[in-house]
């Protein structure tokens, strides 16, 4: 299992909607005894490790899991729409969060976390991260722009 981020930087004018995406590459575990816990959170660029500090996004804590017995479980605690958020996971491994009507306070480092659970044991914690920069309307573009990562930044962080 591997987590990649198609884009490492999103630059958006205030008021726009933006979809941040992580891609879960799960070639090894398909059909095996593996389940996944997934979440999005805000973090900061720590001195040692990115994505170590967790802060809720717009005071919302997302909980999602793919459980073999209950593959469709989406366990977010309340409707993310209340917070102007949408969280989605598709069959291609795209795990995304959409922020509606972004404001300057939405700027920050966004992390997706995927925990692979095998035989009830959390085997690995994999992170993807990206930066969102929200700019004031004056002189900024009218739509969001996404920038791909540098080669050295494209792989996910893994913490056993």
């Amino acid at each position: 299992i591997k987590v990649t981020t198609p884009y490492s930087l999103y630059v958006c004018p205030e008021g726009q909607n933006v979809t941040l995406t992580c891609r879960i590459l799960d070639s090894v575990s398909k059909g095996h005894d593996a389940n996944f816990l997934k979440t999005w959170f805000l973090s900061s660029r720590g001195e040692v490790q990115v994505c170590k500090e967790h802060r809720p996004i717009r005071n919302f804590i997302s909980h999602h899991q793919h459980h073999r017995s209950h593959p469709a479980v989406n366990a977010s605690h309340d409707q993310p729409q209340k917070h102007g958020l949408e969280i989605a996971y598709d069959n291609h491994g795209n795990f995304s969060i959409t922020l509606h009507n972004v404001t300057l306070s939405d700027s920050g480092l966004y992390c997706c976390l995927v925990i692979e659970v095998k035989h009830h044991h959390p085997e690995r914690r994999l992170y993807g991260y990206m930066e969102l920069q929200v700019q004031t309307g004056k002189g900024s573009a009218s739509t969001c722009t996404a920038y791909p990562p540098n080669e050295q930044d494209s792989d996910s962080i893994t913490a056993a």
Partner: antibody, heavy 119, light 107 residues
Framework: QVQLQESGPGLVKPSDTLSLTCTVS?????????WNWIRQTPGKGLEWIGH???????SYNPSLRSRVTISRDTSKNQFSLKLSSVTAADTATYSC????????????WGTGTTVTVSS | EIVLTQSPATLSLSPGERATLSCRAS?????IHWYQQKPGQAPRPLIY???YRATGIPARFSGSGSGTDNTLTISSLEPEDSAVYYC??????????FGGGTKLEVK
């Protein structure tokens, strides 16, 4: 293995400040995890008081926020609870516990210490 | 804050029987965690993230549910399962909240 041990006075007078310390062995409190205080009363059951993270940031239960301070002493690998203006309602067994950031459950607990508020 | 209501408050069953403990949330939660507490001891983690057994927990313990309704099942009771069982959520935060507990007697 990781162990947590609470210490502090078992009797506190009303209106005084309750002070407890949790000593952690087998793991550095600056490495990871959130370090929590939880109390248990026969009437209210288990109640989360608050936590301090590995980086030193704190979060408190809104119902107690005005009276609670959680701090740490990294040189001693300890974190502490102060609860001011105590009343008989604060009589409880106080426990410290460790929780990983995600999926947010308490995997290691201290044995707990009973604090009685009485004059 | 999210209120967790556990039922039944007490449950008395015989060894070998199946126990079903309920935890109902006042609004939809993410994961529910379950703990076991015996007299004079600290709570012990049992099930995390709704489904997964914590380290050292036997397979007779299982968790299920989503949204507002979650269940802890003990498939074949042993005398040592006598304890109080608590559920906990960290979805609405702060505060983290616990259920009021279910006292299980196996005799």
């Amino acid at each position: 293995q990781v162990q947590l041990q609470e210490s502090g006075p078992g009797l506190v007078k009303p209106s005084d400040t309750l002070s407890l310390t949790c000593t952690v062995s087998g793991y550095s409190i600056t490495s990871d995890y959130t370090w929590n205080w939880i109390r248990q009363t026969p009437g209210k059951g288990l109640e989360w008081i608050g936590h301090i993270t590995y980086s030193g940031s704190v979060s408190y239960n809104p119902s107690l926020r005005s009276r609670v301070t959680i701090s740490r002493d990294t040189s001693k690998n300890q974190f502490s609870l102060k609860l001011s203006s105590v009343t008989a309602a604060d009589t409880a067994t106080y426990s410290c516990a460790r929780a990983l950031y995600y999926p947010w459950y308490f995997d290691v607990w201290g044995t707990g210490t009973t604090v009685t508020v009485s004059s | 804050e999210i209120v967790l209501t556990q039922s039944p408050a007490t449950l008395s069953l015989s060894p070998g029987e199946r126990a079903t403990l309920s935890c109902r949330a006042s609004s939809s939660v993410g994961y529910i965690h379950w703990y076991q507490q015996k007299p004079g001891q600290a709570p012990r983690p049992l099930i995390y993230a709704t489904y997964y057994r914590a380290t050292g927990i036997p397979a007779r313990f299982s968790g299920s549910g989503s949204g507002t309704d979650n269940t802890l099942t003990i498939s074949s009771l042993e005398p040592e399962d006598s304890a109080v069982y608590y559920c906990q959520q960290w979805s609405s935060y702060p505060p983290i909240t616990f259920g009021g507990g279910t006292k299980l007697e196996v005799k």
